[in-house]
């Protein structure tokens, strides 16, 4: 049975709409909650597409608009249609088309071809995408001054980038409960707005924020050591597109030092957490002396799955240890700020020599010639194996 | 799998200096210590020293303590060795090592013979 | 240092044969003894570690035993590929120091 509707099924998920002059709107399509494919052809009055006209069509993989009237899209137009991969534009009137329409799209496939898209810093990004045989791009046609059949390159003076961002910071150190500015300066051709994304400052800094293009200054009220490691961000964006720069405010603050009780892993570990800004320099103690280190004994980090703290974990990690190593380890942390220190007692092992004055002593006699194999138990006390 | 490359041979003259390369791949470079061993033509197993590639630090026997410098290069998983002062004596093939998953040398080098001549 | 003492220096044997070498520590060094054998022109091979756990793809032939300072490495029913230079050393903390060598040779 043939389909008088303006709009009619193909398959069981697509919609034609054909019959000429009778769509100004795709807003409201009947059935559209869960179509694929959109096909629409011959719509001298469809001139512009908004974001609401695709709304409630989240499953939407392939849209072409093709021999209509269609001037403008807006650059949220496929807000609602995440899935979109395939996006036919050809044969329309379209001058321009902003990046910000595809960005966030995985497009397989765009064609422009037959629109009298005009040669501008605006349509940088298509040029860059058919150079680079991005998403198979077509567009044929693009007017410089006057109609081409090829896609012609900007004038060599013509100087088409996305903005430049800097963000200014203080040089002296930040410490604990001090405001720090920030100031993002932006450059670049036809600006069209700027801000900071600050999301992950919560808790750590009340924030104001003041100015407007091409200066957006910052203060972070009364920061704290949560603002370590955390991302301060502006972007700013124009005709070509978007450029962001973070920084990360440094807030200085004295070392701590945790210890565990020493937990047989693979090898012998004695857990440790330092934290400090800057990162503090650790050094180890066994029974009051520096402990030096060797591939018997030795400080391991734990590679932390967090680059977004300050606090480092990690183990002394012992190879092997025997009663001589039991004692007491002492961690010292220190920066510029303060130093800390943690003690744990650590046994690993029984030492074999030791007895209780009631046993009976063990006596070896030696053969006269001396070549006993027998050692002398006594342990001495500056002959530690890990030194 | 582990591997520790160095070049076959060196030809140094006497009282020159000489870095000897150790290129690790196949594991976590900074989680092992590196060491060198010396073995002269004909004679045992000589350990040198040590070193944490994690942090540089080093330990060397004391006869070596004056003719070895350790180092290391982690952007490349490298470890070098420097040999300073050559004489005939330095003449050896120098290997690096790493330990497996206990304190024992599973994984050596192919070693790099020195030659110390005039 | 702790020093190891090796013996024999050299040993002749055929195939089939089982021997013994020895190595002696000049302190107690535990468990923490590890053989390893040379071919000439080759690096050294990992056997044994803390004494008689053998290595991955050693075969069972070889086994070690000993604690304390007396420590020996008994190879049975000897294979061709088995002749070569045999080291003991002891891994108990640093410096780390071998034996002199044993060499067995195809009598």
């Known amino acids: 049975a043939s389909c008088r509707e303006v709009c009619c099924p193909v398959g069981p998920s697509g919609l034609r709409c054909t019959r000429a002059g009778s769509l100004d709107t795709l807003r409201g399509l009947r059935g559209a909650g869960n179509l694929t494919e959109l096909y629409v052809e011959n719509q001298q009055h469809l001139q512009r597409l908004e974001f609401e006209d695709l709304q409630g069509l989240g499953e939407l993989r392939s849209l072409t608009i093709v021999k209509s009237g269609l001037r403008f899209v807006a650059p949220d137009a496929f807000r609602f249609t995440p899935r979109l991969s395939h996006l036919n534009l050809s044969s329309n009137a379209l001058e321009s088309l902003s990046w910000k329409t595809v960005q966030g799209l995985s497009l397989q496939d765009l064609t422009l071809s037959g629109n009298p898209l005009h040669c501008s810093c605006a349509l940088f990004w298509l040029q860059r995408w058919e150079q680079e045989g991005l998403c198979g791009v077509h567009t044929q046609t693009l007017h410089d001054s006057g109609p081409g059949d090829q896609f012609l390159p900007l004038g060599h003076n013509t100087s088409c980038g996305v903005p430049t961002v800097k963000i200014q910071m203080p040089n002296d150190s930040v410490e604990v409960g001090d405001d720090v500015f920030l100031q993002c300066q932006v450059e670049g051709l036809a600006l069209q707005q700027a801000d900071w994304i600050l999301t992950e400052l919560e808790g750590a800094a009340t924030v104001k924020k003041f100015g407007d293009l091409p200066s957006l200054g910052l203060i972070l009220v009364n920061v704290t050591s949560d603002l370590n490691k955390k991302n301060v961000t502006c972007w700013a964006e124009n005709d070509v597109g978007r450029a962001e720069v973070s920084v990360q405010v440094s807030v200085s603050f004295p070392a701590s030092v945790h210890l565990g009780l020493a937990v047989e892993q693979h090898h012998w570990c004695i857990p440790f957490s330092v934290d400090g800004q800057p990162a503090p320099s650790l050094r180890w103690l066994f029974n009051g002396s520096v402990l030096n280190e060797t591939s018997f004994i030795f400080t391991q980090f734990l590679e932390s799955a967090l680059t977004n703290e300050t606090m480092r974990h990690g183990c002394l990690r012992l190879n092997q240890p025997t009663h001589v190593n039991n004692g007491n380890y002492t961690l010292l942390a220190a920066n510029p700020y303060g130093q800390a220190a943690a003690s744990v007692m650590a046994a690993f092992m029984d030492n074999p020599f030791e007895f209780n004055p009631e046993d009976p002593i063990p006596v070896s006699f030696s053969p006269v010639d001396g070549n006993s194999t027998s050692r002398d138990p006594v342990e001495k006390k500056d002959e530690t194996p890990f030194g | 799998q582990v591997q520790l490359q160095q070049p076959g041979a060196e030809l140094v003259k006497p009282g020159a200096s000489v870095q000897l390369s150790c290129k690790a791949s196949?594991?976590?470079?900074?989680?092992?210590?590196i060491h060198w061993v010396k073995q002269r033509p004909g004679q045992g197993l000589e350990w040198i020293g040590e070193i944490n590639p994690n942090n540089g630090l080093t330990n060397y026997i004391e006869k070596f303590k004056n003719k070895a410098t350790l180092t290391i290069d982690k952007s490349s998983n490298t470890a070098y060795m420097q040999l300073s002062g050559l004489t005939p004596e330095d003449s050896a093939v120098y290997y690096c090592?790493?330990?497996?998953?206990?304190?024992?040398?599973?994984?050596w080098g192919q070693g790099t013979l020195v030659t110390v001549s005039a | 240092d702790i020093q190891m003492t090796q013996s024999p220096a050299s040993l002749s044997a055929s195939v089939g044969d089982t021997v013994t070498i020895t190595c002696r520590a000049s302190e107690n060094i535990y468990t923490y003894l590890a053989w390893y054998q040379q071919k000439q022109g080759k690096s050294p091979q990992l056997l044994v570690h803390n004494t008689k756990t053998l290595a991955e793809g050693v075969p069972s032939r070889f086994s070690g035993s000993g604690s304390g300072t007396q420590f020996s490495l008994k190879i049975s029913s000897l294979q061709p590929e088995d002749f070569g230079t045999y080291y003991c050393q002891h891994h108990y903390g640093v410096p780390l120091t071998f034996g002199a060598g044993t060499k067995l040779e195809l009598k």
């Open positions: 090592a790493k330990y497996g998953n206990y304190v024992a040398f599973a994984y």
């Open positions: 196949g594991y976590t470079f900074t989680s092992y210590w």
